[in-house]
Structures are given as structure tokens and as C-alpha cells.
């Protein structure tokens, strides 16, 4: 059928509550695009009547609440005036127990989010609620041990639980409890997150390392479209910012009327230790004006650049 | 909709209490935190603190910690924030406000504001 | 705290023209969950402020679309593309990541 397939990682999830997923594979989704959500290669859509307990909406698959038969490989097809991409997503579907006595309390989880707080800062955990504009979510409510958060050093703010003066005390097994809303029907959306203490600084204290570029030159013709990425490797918890600047400048800012030259979409793939984050700089049509214009890659406090080069002539054509 | 009313303007001696009261409507009272904000003539915005309905729960900006208490009547959907020992320099319009959605930050509910004139 | 500085202090603009503001925050806004925690507010007189962009470049809920905000972790842009009669007022930045919650100085615009 001439679609490109494309293999995203697998979502562990819990059963009984609310999921959503969206399709959007950048740069792909950004310009005008069919959505079409498949289950097992089925040749019937998902449905999109909002009734249906999955269905979908817009570019999201909906799942109102997610059941134990629901595990397997969704497609989700993208379809452009002159491209087509099949994007499978592996859904595991598992029972969770949260506080129920009997089976002793929180589960392990591993699986879950894992977030770190700072000791000795103020930090804050976030709920991740990843649902589509027709989900009205509700207040949201903290749980550590399985026992709602109060006290002075802890303030919910939207999807936000903040944390005053981190302790290591705080580390432990967490919950985040939200409402969601959806065609008069509630649900409720419980996220376990695990959570660890570290010393070490936080909010961009870590230097990130820009394995690609290397400050270098590369060669170009004239009027050819040219895309770079800038890979970055970083800690986990970093909340560093990558981008593509020229003459310190935002690549789109400065390129802001003819948008001849943009920064793409953040891509990160998460390893053990570190992740692993990508953003490219592509130039539409390479104009003289870019020649020996150094175009930085920032990432934190790291920088790196390149340099666009005429080819040397080619005698060997004449 | 989302409506806030705000309690008229009040004159106030140095050294004297002042109350300003915000009753909500069109949504449901005890879910959203009521923030107080203020400006001064020809300062800019200050954000005093804020209050959640649920839990009685204060988060006060330093500035203010001695001197505001915030408190509420659920039975008519009123928050008060009493700003106590009043100065010259108290003298301001205050504002409650409260925020987008429960998971969207940005006050895009106000109260139409009370001017407090604090003058010997 | 986090302390937010606009520039300029002042903007008088010819109706149809754009107009560009700027903040700086003394600490990065962007959150390791990805969302940055800056909005930006127009102050009419004798009106309560209003929400235009939230999130860094959101635009909320009733706001014109030739409103736009942009920025990084530390550095904002609000852009008006063709500046009307009705946006004149006083323009202001603010964060939320963390308590308390700031906002910058003020931007006021009028018009030429």
C-alpha cells in the first residue's frame, strides 16, 4: 500500500482507567494530514463515534477506560498529499492494585514514572495527564504511601505537586489522582510515580554533551535543501534547552518572515543512565548568505556549530 | 460562566485592617486555588498569594506572611483576604484571580478589583 | 524568587504596524516535563489584566491571533503583527514555576 512503517516503543498500562495516545510523528503530522487509527492490522478504522468506549479523536485513540483485552499493536495511518506512514504502537494492558490492603499495598513500580527530587531545593513532581481536548480533567489530588500529601511544604499547582526544601524523606512510592470528564461520564486517572532523592544540582546544574557537531565546515551546493541534527546527550532529570541559534539569535526568529530556515521538532530516545536528544536545523534552500555563518547548536551551557561550504570545483568536469 | 465580584472600595486610617471579599460563580468553588493580586498607582502587578477553598490552604508570598490572612465562607462561595497594620504604601487596587483550568496555570478569571486608599 | 525584567519600558506603535516585546527570567521556566511556566497579561485601563498567551505560546481562550509568544527557557517574545487601536495598554510578564509567582515590570504600549 506504499506506506512507510514506522515502529514506535512499547506503552505499559494500567487497566480500568482512561488512556489516550496521540499520533503525531513530526515533521510529518505538522502539515495538512489524514489520521487514521487501526487496531491489529484490522482493515476497519477504530471508530470515531465518541460513544464507543475506544474511538478516535481527531488525532488521538481514546480509550474510556482501558481493559484487560485491549493489550496489542495499534496502527495509526498518516496520510499527506504525497506520503503515506503506518505508526504501530504496542499497547500492554496490566491490572494494577493500588492501596488495596489485601494485596499489600502499592505495587512495584518500576513500570511507572520515575521522577527525582533535589535535596535541599525546592522541586516538584509532575502528573503527566496526556489526553485530547475533549477530556475535562478535574482536580488533582497527591498520595504518598497511599495517604493524601498535606502540609506547608507541599502546594498542588495545576498538574504540579511542589516540594519545599526537599528531605530525604520524600523519596518513596507516589501517586497522583485526577478526574477526568468526558461526554458527562467521569473517570478517574490514577499515575504511580517513584520517586528518588539525588544531592547532586538540578535544573540545568548538569553539562550537556553534543556528540554531533563538532564545529566543522560542510560542503553544500547552492539552492539544496540541507538538514542537520544537533545530537545531544544529557541526564535524565535535565531541564536543559536545545535549540538552533545564528547570530544569537533563534534560527526561527531570525528566519522568522521567509521561514527558509527552521528548527525541527525535539526528538530524545531514553537510555539507562542518560537520554539521548535530537533537534535538526533544516534549510529549505541553501542561499550564498549562509555561506561562513557559523549556526549553533546551544544545549544548556554546551555549544557547537557548523559552517556551510561552497564544494570545491570539480576540475575532472571539465 | 466563570464570574468574580469583588466587595466596593473602602478609605483606611494607618495602622487599620481592611477586608476584601471575591464571591465566585459558574464553577465548583472548593477545586480551584483563589489568588490575590494587587497594583499599587503606577507599579506593576504583585501577586500577594493564594488560597484553596478545599483544606482551608494558604500559600502566602513572604512579603505579606505577617500581615494577610485569607480565609473563606463555602455556603456563599466568598474568599476574604485581610491585609492587616495598613500603610501608605498598601494603598492599591487588589484583584482576585483565579486560574485557566485545573491543569492550566495563567489567571484568566479576575475579579473586577477593589481600591483600598490607605490616608491619615 | 524569580525575578522577571521587560524590555523596553515603553512602545508607541503606528496602528497596522508589529510590535515586539521582550522578558528575561533570572531562572529557566522550562520544567523537565517540557512545559515552560510563562505567561503574558494585557492591563487596560480600568479593566481587570488579561490572559493572552499562557504557557509560553499558547494563546488563550478570545485572544486575536495576531498575537504570538515565543522564547527559550530564559528569554520571551511577545509579537503583535499589525498592532490595533484596542491593544493599547499596559503588557506584562509572569511565571509560575515556582512560588511566588512574579511578573515583570510592565510594557506599556500606545499607539502613534
Known amino acids: 500500500d506504499g506506506c512507510k512503517d514506522i515502529f514506535m516503543k512499547n506503552e505499559i498500562l494500567s487497566a480500568s482507567q482512561p488512556f489516550a495516545f496521540n499520533c503525531t510523528f513530526p515533521p510529518i503530522t505538522s502539515g495538512e494530514v489524514s489520521v487514521t487509527w487501526y487496531k491489529n492490522s484490522s482493515k476497519i478504522p477504530v471508530s470515531k463515534i465518541i460513544q464507543s468506549r475506544i474511538h478516535q479523536d481527531e488525532t488521538w485513540i481514546l480509550f474510556l477506560p482501558m481493559e484487560w483485552g485491549d493489550s496489542g499493536v495499534y496502527q495509526c495511518v498518516i496520510k499527506g498529499r504525497d506520503s503515506c506512514h503506518r505508526i504501530h504502537v504496542n499497547l500492554t494492558v496490566f491490572e494494577k492494585h493500588w492501596c488495596d490492603t489485601s494485596i499489600g499495598g502499592l505495587p512495584n513500580l518500576s513500570d511507572e514514572y520515575k521522577q527525582i527530587l533535589h535535596l535541599g531545593k525546592d522541586d516538584s513532581l509532575t502528573c503527566h495527564l496526556h489526553f485530547p481536548k475533549s477530556c475535562v480533567l478535574g482536580p488533582i489530588k497527591w498520595y504518598k504511601d497511599c495517604n493524601e500529601i498535606k502540609g506547608e511544604r507541599f502546594t498542588v499547582l495545576e498538574t504540579r505537586l511542589l516540594v519545599s526544601n526537599v528531605s530525604a524523606e520524600d523519596r518513596g512510592n507516589y501517586a497522583c489522582q485526577a478526574i477526568l470528564t468526558h461526554s458527562g461520564k467521569q473517570y478517574e486517572v490514577l499515575n504511580g510515580i517513584t520517586v528518588s532523592i539525588t544531592e547532586r544540582a538540578g535544573y540545568g546544574g548538569s553539562v550537556p554533551k553534543i556528540i554531533y557537531p563538532k564545529n566543522h565546515s560542510i560542503e553544500v551546493q547552492l539552492g539544496t535543501t540541507l538538514i542537520v541534527d544537533c545530537n545531544v546527550t544529557d541526564t535524565k532529570d535535565n531541564t536543559n534547552l536545545r535549540c538552533w541559534r545564528v547570530n544569537n539569535t533563534l534560527v526561527d526568529d531570525y528566519y522568522d518572515e521567509s521561514k527558509r530556515i527552521r528548527e525541527g521538532v525535539e526528538t530524545h530516545v531514553s537510555f539507562r543512565e542518560h537520554n539521548l536528544y535530537t533537534v535538526n536545523i533544516t534549510f529549505l534552500e541553501v542561499k550564498m548568505e549562509d555561506y561562513g555563518l557559523p549556526f549553533m547548536c546551544h544545549a544548556g551551557v554546551s555549544t557547537a556549530y557548523i559552517i556551510l561550504q561552497l564544494p570545491a570545483p570539480d576540475f575532472r568536469a571539465y | 460562566q466563570v464570574q468574580l465580584v469583588q466587595s466596593g472600595a473602602e478609605v483606611k486610617k494607618p495602622g487599620a485592617s481592611v477586608k476584601v471579599s471575591c464571591k465566585a460563580s459558574g464553577y465548583t468553588f472548593t477545586n480551584y486555588w483563589m489568588n490575590w493580586v494587587r497594583q499599587a498607582p503606577r507599579q506593576g502587578l504583585e501577586w500577594m498569594g493564594m488560597?484553596?477553598?478545599?483544606?482551608?490552604?494558604?500559600r502566602l508570598n513572604q512579603k505579606f506572611k505577617d500581615r494577610v490572612t485569607m480565609t473563606r465562607d463555602t455556603s456563599t462561595s466568598t474568599v476574604y483576604m485581610e491585609l492587616s497594620s495598613l500603610r501608605s504604601e498598601d494603598t492599591a487596587v487588589y484583584y482576585c484571580a483565579r486560574t485557566t483550568s485545573m491543569i492550566i496555570g495563567g489567571f484568566a478569571y479576575w475579579g473586577q478589583g477593589t481600591l483600598v486608599t490607605v490616608s491619615s | 524568587d524569580i525575578v522577571m525584567t521587560q524590555t523596553p519600558l515603553s512602545l508607541s506603535v503606528t496602528p497596522g504596524q508589529p510590535a515586539s516585546i521582550s522578558c528575561r527570567s533570572s531562572?529557566?521556566?522550562?520544567?523537565?516535563?517540557?512545559?515552560?511556566?510563562f505567561y503574558w497579561y494585557l492591563h487596560k485601563p480600568g479593566q481587570p489584566p488579561q490572559l493572552l498567551i499562557y504557557q509560553m505560546s499558547n494563546l488563550a481562550s478570545g485572544v486575536p491571533d495576531r498575537f504570538s509568544g515565543s522564547g527559550s527557557g530564559t528569554d520571551f517574545t511577545l509579537k503583535i503583527s499589525r498592532v490595533e487601536a484596542e491593544d493599547v495598554g499596559v503588557y506584562y510578564c509572569a511565571q509560575n514555576l515556582e512560588l511566588p509567582l512574579t511578573f515583570g515590570g510592565g510594557t506599556k504600549v500606545e499607539i502613534k
Open positions: 488560597f484553596h477553598p478545599y483544606g482551608d490552604v494558604t
Open positions: 531562572k529557566s521556566l522550562l520544567h523537565r516535563n517540557a512545559i515552560t511556566y
